[in-house]
Each structure stands twice: as C-alpha cells, then as structure tokens.
C-alpha cells in the first residue's frame, strides 16, 4: 500500500503517521488509543507529588496539594512562615490550593 494513511481516520484532531509499512495515529493532547478516540489519562503517571490528589480536568489535570505543599504538581514545600520555595508565588493561589 503506497499510502498507508489512505482512508485512515484519526479522531479528535489526531494525525495519521506512516512508517515501516504500517500506520498509526499521533493523537492530540488529551487523547489516546489506536484511533485517538479515548480520553488520555493525565493522572496515570501520578504527577502530583507529596500526597497530592490528581484529577482529570478539561485543561489536562489538576492537583489538590496536601497541606504544606504548593505548585502545579505540589512540588514546592511551603515554609512555616507561609512563604514558599518558589521564587515568587503565583498570584491568587494559596498554599495547599489545587493547582492547574
């Protein structure tokens, strides 16, 4: 087959990729599976550190950080004085808040 991707439909904005006599779908962010029809699991790799609770979210994932940690992946400890290890805390976020 000269055109492995002929008639091949990749859903949800995925792109068909040819190679080695086979074809596969390169899926858009947030999707997976053979035809990109499955919602990808953004929490599969346990991205939330230090006991953070991971939720799939329309924007990808969100971490609910355990008390004492902050950051998009709960990676930054909050110091006892309330300051964080971040150079500057993102505006509008409190220590322990879930982070996008």
């Amino acid at each position: 087959d000269l055109d492995d991707c002929a008639g091949r439909a990749c859903a949800n904005g995925g792109t068909c990729v040819e190679g080695g006599g086979a074809h596969r779908c390169s899926c858009a962010l947030g999707f997976g599976g053979r035809d990109c029809r499955e919602r990808a699991d953004p929490c599969a790799a346990r991205p939330c550190a230090h006991g953070g609770r991971c939720y799939a979210h329309f924007s990808g994932l969100v971490c609910a950080c355990a008390p004492g940690y902050m950051g998009a992946r709960c990676e930054f400890p909050v110091h006892p004085d309330g300051a964080s290890a971040l150079p500057a805390a993102p505006p509008g976020l409190r220590p322990g808040d879930p982070q996008r």
Epitope: R39, D41, A44, R53, C54, A56, D97
Partner: antibody
C-alpha cells in the same frame, strides 16, 4: 445521561464476605476524578468508606475504620467493586456508589450517586 | 475528625427560614472544603453546596451556605414543602492521607 448503579447486595452471615459492584453509564471513570463508596445504616447517617482514582493510577483512600476489611478496586473503565470481609451486624447498611469531582479548588464533591444496594448481615 | 450538626430536628412553616449549623473539630482542607447534601427517604443524597458557599448545579438560590475553618451554616429561606428532608454536612481533611467525614444529619420538618 450519566448514571451509577450498585449491585451485589443481599443477606450475608456474620463473618462472611461480599463484593459489591458499581456500574457507570453515560461516562467513563478515567475522565471523572474518583469513584467512592459511602454507606448508611438503617435510620442512621452517612459514612464514607473509600475512594479510588478513576484513572489508571489506581490510587486509593480509605476511612481508618475500613482499612483491612474493605478493599476498593476498579475492574474496568465503567465498574468499581468493594470487597468486604469479616462482616458483622454493624455493617448492615445501604451502600452507595458516588462520583467525587474537583470543583473550584475543592475535592470529595459527590455530585453523582447511585440508588444504593442493601447489605444485611444476619444469622 | 468529628462534624457536629445542630439542631435536629428543626421545624418551620412554609415560607419561613431554617438555619443548620455544622461544627468541625478541626479545620477542613483549605478552610472551605465543606459540602452540604439533601437526602429524602428512600433516595440517595443530593449535592446542594460545595466549597462551603457555592451552589451546585440546579439548586435554587434559597439555599445558602456560609462559614470557614471549623464553623459552617446552611440557611434555607422561603421554605417549601419539598424542602422537608435530612441535611448532611461533609468535610474533607488530610492527615497522612485524604479522608472525608459526614455530620450526623439534621432533619428539617416543614409545617
């Protein structure tokens, strides 16, 4: 339409075991936060038991009193089970399956519930 | 952690107002991770309020949640017969792991 339905309840002898199943329709667990079990003894209040991540990580949380005797697991993208062992009369209750979603920086928001399944522990 | 609800039961006439209190033995997660549920006999609970004061989808504005930390209140105004139910508060905590606790429930009687 999003729905949860529990099954597997019934009469069980003290010290017996039982496995409850929660089946979802209209959505898949992987995109829906956590799936949880809550129980309610006849005429009593609600009691949280456990939650499991809807995704593939399988992360779980248990009430302290449930650790050891209760085990939550995800058997497919639309089914969650609760295995209960060493049951006593005090475990007699309606067992609800509920979906826990993240809303506005808060968690453990149970915005979808099943109708419940009754477990009676009696000799 | 214990969530203590008072009073129970509470009664008021149609069109009246009832206030239910929920006292936590320690602060809930982020000081606002508290929800309120309504339950009628033979039915599962229904989420009314999340984040202490935010109305869940489809819930009328007659229901109002307030409070932070350890002290929370649910107020139901312009009472309707359909509001007769048991109401539960639910707090979320973290202590070497996540967990959740429900209050004992408050029965609302509409006269």
């Amino acid at each position: 339409q999003e729905q949860l339905v529990e099954s597997g309840g019934g009469l069980v002898q003290p010290e017996g075991s039982l496995t409850l199943t929660c089946t979802a329709s209209g959505f898949s667990f992987s995109s829906s936060g956590y799936m949880c079990w809550v129980r309610q003894a006849p005429g009593k209040g609600l009691e949280w038991i456990a939650c499991i991540s809807g995704g593939s990580s399988g992360d779980t949380d248990y009430a302290n009193w449930a650790k050891g005797r209760f085990s939550i697991s995800k058997t497919s993208s639309t089914t969650v089970t609760l295995q209960m062992t060493s049951l006593t009369v005090a475990d007699t209750a309606t067992y609800f399956c509920a979906r826990d979603v993240y809303i506005d920086s808060t968690i453990f928001n149970f915005n979808l519930w099943g109708p419940g399944t009754l477990v009676t522990v009696s000799s | 952690q214990v969530l203590t609800q008072t009073p129970s039961p509470v009664s008021a006439a149609v069109g009246g107002t009832v206030t239910i209190s929920c006292q936590a033995s320690q602060s809930v997660y982020n000081n606002n991770n508290l929800a309120w549920y309504q339950q009628k006999p033979g039915q599962p609970p229904k989420l009314l309020i999340y984040a202490a004061s935010s109305l869940a989808s489809g819930v009328p504005s007659r229901f109002k949640g307030s409070g932070a930390g350890t002290q929370f209140t649910l107020t139901i105004s312009d009472l309707e017969c359909d509001d007769a139910a048991t109401y539960y508060c639910q707090g979320t905590y973290y202590s070497s792991g996540w967990y959740s606790t429900f209050g004992g429930g408050t029965e609302v009687v509409v006269k």
